[in-house]
Amino acid sequence: KIDTPQRGSIQDINHRVWVLQDQTLIAVPRKDRMSPVTIALISCRHVETLEKDRGNPIYLGLNGLNLCLMCAKVGDQPTLQLKEKDIMDLYNQPEPVKSFLFYHSQSGRNSTFESVAFPGWFIAVSSEGGCPLILTQELGKANTTDFGLTMLF
């Protein structure tokens, strides 16, 4: 098993990248002198206790920043949040920490990230751009849930 996080860069089909702005991840068109975040990801080591056919369960963080993506309900609405957390602390926990886990599915060059805590809810960006990343149940409508993930070695 790999027990160090892998690093990657992400953009959506409109070539927008993820940028950290005031502790919030937003998707913006790539420009010069811009610093897109580098993603840190690591597979859950308790994969045998999670559903088999939804994708690879991963923890998603921001490389070098001790910030991880998590899903939590605000009222009745699952929301995407950044929490100060060491991704390896999550990896080493005795059980899957579902609020921080995403099923990573790949189809060709496209990746989707589905919340383990809230099945059917996916990381998404508004088609308008310049907006925060969100969770959505509505695939392929006003929001983009397909991303290109390029691993950095």
């Epitope: 206790t49 999670l50 957390k85 602390d89 926990q93 005795p94 059980e95």
Partner: antibody, heavy 121, light 109 residues
Framework: EVQLQQSGAELVEPGASVKLSCTAS????????INWVKQRPEQGLEWIGR????????RYAPKFQGKATITSDTSSNTAYLQLSSLTSEDAAVYSC??????????????WGQGTTLTVSS | QAVVTQESALTTSPGETVTLTCRSS?????????ANWVQEKPDHLFTGLIG???NRAPGVPARFSGSLIGDKAALTITGAQTEDEAIYFC?????????FGGGTKLTVL
Amino acid sequence: EVQLQQSGAELVEPGASVKLSCTASGFNIKDTYINWVKQRPEQGLEWIGRIDPANGYTRYAPKFQGKATITSDTSSNTAYLQLSSLTSEDAAVYSCSTLNYYGSSFFFDFWGQGTTLTVSS
Amino acid sequence: QAVVTQESALTTSPGETVTLTCRSSTGAVTTSNYANWVQEKPDHLFTGLIGGTNNRAPGVPARFSGSLIGDKAALTITGAQTEDEAIYFCALWYSNHWVFGGGTKLTVL
């Protein structure tokens, strides 16, 4: 208010099976891991295993593989512990507990009141 | 399977500091054992106190703290109160299962 309500005391004959229940109120069992532990007088606690009610996946302590079966029914918000081929060694109090993640750790936080199992002919 | 050992009984006085320990038969207890501490009062009333070696569960009084002391996990009660009289169990994680100790009966006289 969060509560785990366990089924009542059982008197069962050796060789038989028994199914104990643990019904949650105040939260959805799909949002936690439900654990079962065994307690005999002067013998401490023994962890039997756990279930993730969201998907039905279980883990067991090596000693209880084949002896215990943990299941759940999310429609009734209930977890079950079935014990088979009962002997006097299985006579004990059995308790259910939630295992929840807060902030940075998992905790055995909420507990049922225990079910006393007596094995006797 | 690993064996987890605790003091069978300890006695303290109100206001005193007392430390309960938890030893593993497999070697030193480390943060990878995610030590949990649970309190049992009469009639099988259990309360989770500590998780992940040193993190207090929500609502647990600050006088309870968890740590590693030498090769053991420890629960320290700073300024014990009469209501802390109970049995205290530790649980250690071993790769894919938990093992509980035999419990420490704490008397506060």
